[in-house]
């Protein structure tokens, strides 16, 4: 039910990467506005993006309070200029989102190779530990801080002169690989959470090759 010129939101979708989390929906509003509610850990509904004409709402501040919690949101539709108006059943039209558990579902952002250093026939490759918007004790946690050992990285590396790729894995943000002396290598990394059933892998990092600025060489 609801007023005749108000339509319910649909296609509610969570878009989340490294815990930056936005709820999106349709349709673009015509003579109506939207308000979002998100359930907190006490199962109370908290209002966000009140009276917006956008079709998205940034809920990051709410979900980072407990990334292991399973959240539910809903989008309420009101006639434009009357956010207090309700339908014939005494409440606005609304549509529920799918449930969303940030720890299990946020996409892993594209990682970045922070540095690589060659010492003889070994190369140390370090992956940048990206900061998230998750806080603990007033500090922002890194991806590693949040996921711990659930997060691994896979390194793909190959000689610049060939296409045959090798792989290495690590439970930290560092690799130490054997290379042939006098050969240049290229590197790309991918973040993986093996225990997940969805969104297990990030996209590959940009490729970095020896002989470029990020690298360092020591005999």
């Amino acid at each position: 039910s609801g007023t005749t010129n108000t339509v319910a939101a649909y296609n509610l979708t969570w878009k989340s990467t490294n815990f930056k989390t936005i709820l999106e929906w349709e349709p673009k509003p015509v003579n109506q506005v939207y308000t979002v509610q998100i359930s907190d850990r006490s199962r109370n509904w908290k209002y966000k993006c009140t009276g917006t004409t956008d079709t998205e709402c940034d809920l990051t501040d709410e979900i980072v309070k407990d990334v292991n919690w399973t959240y539910e949101a809903r989008v309420l539709s009101y006639p434009a200029g009357n956010v207090e108006s309700t339908g014939s059943a005494g409440e606005p039209l609304y549509e529920n989102s799918p449930e969303f558990t940030p720890y299990l579902e946020t996409n892993l952002g594209q990682p970045t190779i922070q540095s690589f250093e060659q010492v003889g026939t070994k190369v140390n490759v370090t992956v940048e530990d990206e900061r998230t918007l998750v806080r603990r004790n007033n500090t922002f946690l890194s991806l590693r801080d949040v996921f711990g050992k659930d997060l691994i990285y896979t390194l793909y590396y190959w000689k610049s002169s060939s296409s045959g790729k090798k792989t290495a894995k690590t439970n930290t943000n560092e690799f130490l690989i054997d290379v042939d002396k006098g050969e240049n290598y290229c590197f790309s990394v991918q973040a993986v959470i093996p225990s997940r059933t969805v969104n297990r892998k990030s996209t590959d990092s940009p490729v970095e090759c020896m002989g470029q600025e990020k690298g360092e060489f020591r005999e």
């Epitope: 711990g148 290495a168 690590t170 439970n171 225990s195």
Partner: antibody
């Protein structure tokens, strides 16, 4: 040289909460390692309880998860175990351990390389 | 959970003999996460081998580890008196981390 020392009551009554603390000396608890609790029932094998990172990130054994809380206090260089609603089946030697990264096959993986001496906890009325 | 089954339960051998301990997993274990521990009575376990085959610093070279997938082996080439103890394999790749039931190496 990192050393670990468990402390806490040796006797806990059924239905109460078992609380143990592990004090880390000779190194910082915030230095990129994980910190684990393991127990060993009398005359039996080892059972992993759970682990914590200095950031507070935890992993628990699902068989105990509903009763276990592991926390860390970086200011005191300590981490703690709480096990609620204990029964006689929780009588065991409880060990704390450091999980440190070791190089293997191009990457680094964590192994429990430093252990406390263990503390015996008996659950009895 | 991954169940690790160790055999034999007890191994009775004399000093100088070779000990072969088996650890079989209920499903494939990445070698990177396979470790062996030694435990003597009244003591905490001690890390011997990690990555299925790499000796921890200070562990004598008479200890060696091998295997992959579901079958892993710890070999003590020549038993010394101080080697008589209980040995556990452990996997730390899948939660819950699990230990085998142990193999007791006793003096014959």
């Amino acid at each position: 040289q990192v050393q670990l020392q468990e402390s806490g009551p040796g006797l806990v009554k059924p239905s109460q909460t078992l609380s143990l603390t592990c004090t880390v000396s000779g190194g910082s608890i915030s230095s990129g390692q994980y910190w684990s609790w393991i127990r060993q029932h009398p005359g039996k094998g080892l059972e992993w309880i759970g682990e914590i990172y200095y950031s507070g990130s935890t992993r628990y054994n699902p068989s105990l998860k509903s009763r276990v809380t592991i926390s860390v206090d970086t200011s005191k260089n300590q981490f703690s175990l709480k096990l609620s609603s204990v029964t006689a089946a929780d009588t065991a030697v409880y060990y704390c351990a450091r999980d440190a990264p070791y190089y293997y096959g191009g990457g680094y993986y964590y192994y429990m390389d430093v252990w406390g001496k263990g503390t015996t906890v008996t659950v009895s009325s | 959970e991954i169940v690790l089954t160790q055999s034999p339960g007890t191994l009775s051998l004399s000093p100088g003999e070779r000990a072969t301990l088996s650890c079989r997993a209920s499903e494939s274990v990445d070698s990177s996460y396979l470790a062996w521990y030694q435990q003597k009575p009244g003591q905490a376990p001690r890390l011997l081998i990690y990555g299925a085959s790499t000796r921890q610093t200070g562990i004598p070279d008479r200890f060696s580890g091998s295997g992959s997938g579901t079958d892993f082996t710890l070999t003590i080439s020549r038993l010394e008196p101080e080697d008589f103890a209980v040995y556990y394999c452990q996997q730390a790749g899948v939660v819950p981390y699990t230990f085998g039931g142990g193999t007791k190496v006793e003096i014959k």
